[in-house]
């Protein structure tokens, strides 16, 4: 591993659409990939009238937008579906929203999902 880089080997997995997609609902996903590729964790969620609904969590493969991010933070301004990615084992257990376009001091909305259970 490159010095200073947090190697991602596994991520929290969740799929709200698990019945339609025919996957596990929750678990811990081992992250595989080509040797020359970096591995990340991600989370996607929706904000429905102030209520956080997680869509998916899991491994995300070699994406420059995720490099050296220890925290999973969405920075886009009011997306339809929120997305963040990070490096480090299980770094997607918590995620937050800090919109870059805000002029005023942004407020964090950290979300801690329920711990994973194996089906």
């Amino acid at each position: 591993a490159i010095l200073g880089r947090s190697e991602t080997q596994e991520c929290l997995f969740f799929n709200a659409n698990w019945e339609k997609d025919r996957t596990n609902q929750t678990g811990v996903e081992p992250c595989y990939g080509d040797k020359d590729k970096r591995r990340h964790c991600f989370a996607t969620w929706k904000n429905i009238s102030g209520s956080i609904e997680i869509v998916k969590q899991g491994c995300w493969l070699d994406d420059i937008n995720c490099y050296d991010r220890t925290d999973c933070v969405e920075k886009k301004d009011s997306p339809e579906v929120y997305f963040c990615c990070c490096e480090g084992n299980m770094c997607n257990e918590k995620f937050s929203y800090f919109p870059e376009m805000e002029v005023t001091q942004p407020t964090s909305n950290p979300v801690t999902p329920k711990p994973p259970y194996y089906n």
């Epitope: 659409n17 995300w60 493969l61 579906v81």
Partner: antibody
């Protein structure tokens, strides 16, 4: 080097059956989900079916549901597609492809394809 | 099902041209958008995944952009080996769906 090699295609009459195989090498087969994607002559790509790393979950396109069955034998590093009640519209090149993660972020490696022709 | 609409369906260009292909999803797919290149008689080859990431061995002249519903594949300087058909594909949910393809032909 990752390699996927399909076989089992051929000419079959409407209503007939065929079993396609996809032999995998160059990677840890039992760690990856796998897919079948088809392409009718002169047409675009159509997803057919997928199976997770251990065979516990399978999914199908509506057009093949109830007629096709995807399976895998991890001890043989082989993916299968059992096709029954074949129709003329199933005529296509069938590709197997590897899913990059559990939730299928992308299909990173593909086989060369095997042609299935359904005709009387 | 999520519909993927690609445009144009075909285009003619010369070596050295900048080429742009667009793909629109019928609903937000975040960054779950991939681009594949296919040459006649060959299997598709992954070019771009997660909207912006280049696959292994893909030249830097290929780039992807976009998120949500609108995405773009750009070839900055078209080379002879780039003449092919390009497909976008969403992997946000099953069934996985592809765009209709864009055939890049020699002018």
């Amino acid at each position: 080097e990752v390699q996927l090699l399909e076989s089992g295609g051929g000419l079959v009459q409407p209503g007939g059956s065929l079993r396609l195989s996809c032999a995998a090498s160059g990677f840890t087969f039992d760690s990856y989900g796998m897919h079948w994607v088809r392409q009718a002559p002169g047409k675009g790509l159509e997803w057919v079916s997928s199976i997770n790393y251990n065979g516990g979950y399978t999914s199908y396109a509506d057009s093949v549901k109830g007629r096709f069955t995807i399976s895998r034998d991890n001890s043989k590093n082989t993916l299968y597609l059992q096709m029954n009640s074949l129709r003329a519209e199933d005529t296509a090149v069938y590709y197997c492809a590897r899913a990059a993660t559990w939730h299928d972020t992308h299909l990173d490696y593909w086989g060369q394809g095997t042609l299935v022709t359904v005709s009387s | 099902d999520i519909q993927m609409t690609q445009s144009p369906s075909s285009l003619s260009a010369s070596v050295g041209d900048r080429v742009t292909i667009t793909c629109r999803a019928s609903q937000s797919i975040v960054s779950y958008l991939n681009w594949y290149q296919q040459k006649p008689g060959k299997a598709p080859k992954l070019v771009i995944y997660a909207a912006t990431s280049r696959a292994s061995g893909v030249p830097s002249r290929f780039s992807g952009s976009g998120s949500g519903t609108d995405f773009t594949l750009t070839i900055s300087s078209l080379q002879p080996e780039d003449f092919a058909t390009y497909y976008c594909q969403q992997s946000y949910e099953n069934p996985l769906t592809f765009g209709g393809g864009t055939k890049v032909e020699i002018k």
